[in-house]
């Protein structure tokens, strides 16, 4: 941490004879410089050099040749490397006046003589004189103004609307100044920045809108950082709005939008009069083209229980926005002919949600669904297949008889999906077959008994059993089962014998 | 915090029309299923039906069919259930509930509406 | 419609008692099952969703469990605020239906 320069003569201000010259000495532990009042236009006079000594500090002098009232004012040396924008200069100050007898207030830029004031608050009248020991009041409309006075600043205060006049009177001559107009702003301690995109997503060729509104503030100096800054593509536009309430509407237009305008989109507002900033920021993103994107919340493959409810959502990311479209089996759904429901929502600027919805699930729902997602520049589906699961259920179960061989077939034919398996039991003892367990599993090994089982479609399957010789009477019970459920039935199987002899009698 | 506010109770004549409404707030509207259901004093719960506030499709059950309308006034994130022909044992609190549609389960509830109907 | 059997339909029990209540569907239903909490006057809260998941901010002492037509709710350890009436809810299929209801009374 570098100590603060030192200045030469060591006081803290000066009176400097008219035409005379002075000059101002400034030490420092590193390279210095000087700030003085004049603008360098007005600056012929002054000179700056670096001078060498043995002390091992930097020396920077100023030096003026004719002092005039034009150089009245603030002297500040300080460090280069800590000169920012931001904060006021730090260093070490004198203050110099220049008496005149013909120039009792320091000249001013016009700019000077326009004074605002934020609601209610103080502000200062800069009328310096150029002799400290110079008396001077201030005078509006109404009469003399009572402020206080620094001959280094001005007249301080709370100062209504209006033009003010600062008078001086020097050796017994009266001078006043052009009238100081005080102009109220509105101003809040706190800046109220909103930012506004209605987009943030575009394709080449769009034209990028970003706005930022500043609410009851009238001293705002605003910034846009934005990726097309350095080639200046941003048009910026400040509109005013004063009903109901004062708001300034800046916007930054990047007409023929490219990949390269993607980024940050940033408003930076300064309040003018008060180290006040606020910033807020936004991301746009710039594509070659158009895109969809799908994703489901669910698999290829579905299956849904008969009368179920079941909700399928899609998310869908799009731009531009996409018409989203549901197909069953290739074609159109048609929603008041069925139990099915959609809907599409909007849920952010590019993201869509669609939920296909099933009131009570039926065996016709089963089927291929497609979403189809489509824009100008893209298009995208996604296709599923649900299985409506229906529990099993025998259609029929008959016999068929092989005339004389003795040999007969058992046909049972039973749906449900997934496709049912058949099971086949067998009870010899037909007084006992109302006990459980007097049936038994037919196995497929056995050597007189084939069974076989046959696909119809794809919810329809067939059994038979086939016995080589039945030789007393049987019953055949038919088991169809899968996930959801099982069904049996049984037959009685009667032996050729038996079945000839009931037939004569 | 998603809150569902419910209209103040009614008392109806027989034969009248009740229409609850049910405002939603703390969550996107249209992207969550309104229920109606309706609890008798001292009895249980019995589902009315179900309305999608985006597309304002709807589902009512059985015995409510052709007497329950439910609509929805998107603007104002305002669901909305009506009930004709209304007799002395439709008296009941009536309750919208939001339905998860991740879940497909109620995860929300109104705070309730009494309809008295008494002649 | 499917048919929602609760059990018991009241029940008294101390703070600290573990508690079972039971609801039987007439149907599989999978896992498609909730459980609420209902206090006089007030609406119905949800406890338990997807049969076992334990929605946020309700205690641990709460649980579920079953699939296909048997459910339970287990509140492990009864406490003062647990004085309520719990019912059940499938949404396996329209219509949907709800369990009769199990007030838990103090013993």
């Known amino acids: 941490q570098l100590s603060l320069p030192s200045i030469l003569p060591n006081e803290n201000e000066k009176v400097v004879q008219l035409n005379s010259s002075f000059s101002l000495r400034c030490f420092g532990e590193s390279e210095v410089s000087w700030q003085y009042p004049m603008s360098e236009e007005e600056s012929s006079d002054v000179e700056i050099r670096n001078e060498e000594n043995n002390s091992g500090l930097f020396v920077t002098v100023l030096e003026v040749s004719s002092a005039s009232a034009a150089h009245t004012g603030l002297y500040t040396c300080y460090y280069n490397h800590t000169q920012t924008e931001e904060n006021e200069l730090e260093g070490r100050h004198i203050y110099i006046y220049v008496p005149d007898p013909d120039v009792a207030f320091v000249p001013l830029g016009m700019t000077d003589y326009l004074v605002i004031v934020e609601d209610d608050d103080s502000a200062i009248i800069p009328c310096r004189t150029t002799d400290p020991e110079t008396p001077v009041t201030l005078h509006n409309s109404e009469g003399v103004v009572p402020a206080s006075y620094d001959s280094r600043q001005g007249f301080n205060g709370t100062f209504t609307v209006g033009p003010y006049i600062c008078e001086a009177t020097v050796k017994g001559k009266k001078f006043q100044t052009i009238p100081f107009n005080v102009y109220a702003l509105k101003a809040t301690s706190e800046l109220d920045l909103e930012m506004e995109a209605l987009k943030t997503v575009y394709k080449s060729g769009e034209t990028i809108v970003v706005t930022c509104a500043v609410f009851n503030n009238e001293v705002v100096d605003l910034q846009w950082t934005y990726p097309g800054e350095v080639k200046g593509k941003g048009i910026t536009m400040l509109e005013e709005i004063k009903v109901p309430s004062i708001k300034l509407v800046y916007t930054l237009t990047v007409p023929e939008a490219t990949v390269k305008d993607s980024g940050d989109y940033e408003c930076a507002a300064r309040q003018a009069t008060r180290e006040v900033k606020e910033m807020k920021k936004v991301t746009i993103s710039v594509h070659e083209k158009g895109f969809i994107e799908i994703k489901p919340t669910f698999s290829q493959l579905e299956a849904v229980n008969l009368h179920e409810v079941k909700h399928f959502v899609v998310e869908v990311r799009a731009y531009p926005p996409p018409r989203i479209s549901w197909l069953k089996n290739n074609l159109t759904l048609i929603e008041n002919l069925t139990e099915i429901t959609t809907d599409v929502e909007k849920i952010q600027e590019i993201r869509y949600r669609s939920k296909l919805k099933l009131i009570r699930a039926k065996e016709e729902d089963s089927g291929h669904y497609t979403i189809v997602a489509q824009n100008e520049d893209a298009v995208k589906s996604y296709t599923f297949e649900l299985l409506t699961q229906v529990p099993s259920s025998i259609l029929d179960l008959v016999d068929d008889h092989h005339g004389s061989t003795g040999g007969q077939t058992v046909r049972c034919t039973a749906e449900g999906t997934p496709l049912p398996d058949i099971e086949w039991m067998i009870c010899k003892d037909i007084k006992k077959c109302n006990n459980e367990t007097s049936w038994t599993i037919l196995a497929n090994n056995v050597s007189n008994i084939i069974t076989e089982i046959h696909s119809r479609d794809r919810s329809t399957v067939e059994g038979r059993v086939t016995f080589a010789k039945v030789e007393e009477t049987i019953a055949v019970r038919c088991l169809a089962k899968n996930l959801l459920g099982a069904e049996n039935r049984e037959l009685k199987l009667v032996a050729p014998t038996l079945r000839s002899e009931l037939t004569v009698a | 915090q998603v809150q569902l506010v419910q209209s103040g109770a009614e008392v109806k004549k027989p034969g009248a029309s009740v229409k609850v409404s049910c405002k939603a707030s703390g969550y996107t509207f249209t992207s969550y299923d309104i229920n109606w259901v309706r609890q008798a004093t001292g009895q249980g719960l019995e589902w009315m039906g179900w309305m999608n506030p985006n597309s304002g499709n709807t589902g009512y059950a059985q015995q409510f069919q052709g007497r329950v309308t439910m609509t929805r006034n998107t603007s104002i994130t305002t669901a909305y259930m009506e009930l004709s022909s209304l007799r002395s044992e439709d008296t009941a609190v009536y309750y919208c509930?939001?339905?998860?549609?991740?879940?497909?389960?109620?995860?929300?509830w109104g705070q309730g509406t009494l309809v008295t109907v008494s002649s | 419609d499917i048919q929602m059997t609760q059990s018991p339909s009241s029940l008294s029990a101390s703070v600290g008692d573990r508690v079972t209540i039971t609801c039987r569907a007439s149907?599989?239903?999978?896992?498609?099952l909730g459980w609420f909490q209902q206090k006089p006057g007030k609406a119905p809260k949800r406890l338990i969703y997807a049969a076992s998941s334990l929605q946020s901010g309700v205690p641990s002492r709460f649980s579920g469990s079953g699939s296909g037509t048997k459910f339970t709710l287990t509140i492990s350890s009864l406490q003062p605020e647990d004085f309520a009436t719990y019912f059940c809810l499938q949404h396996n299929r329209y219509p949907l239906t709800f369990g009769g209801g199990t007030k838990v009374e103090i013993k």
């Open positions: 149907q599989g239903i999978r896992n498609n």
């Open positions: 509930a939001r339905e998860e549609y991740s879940s497909s389960l109620f995860d929300s």
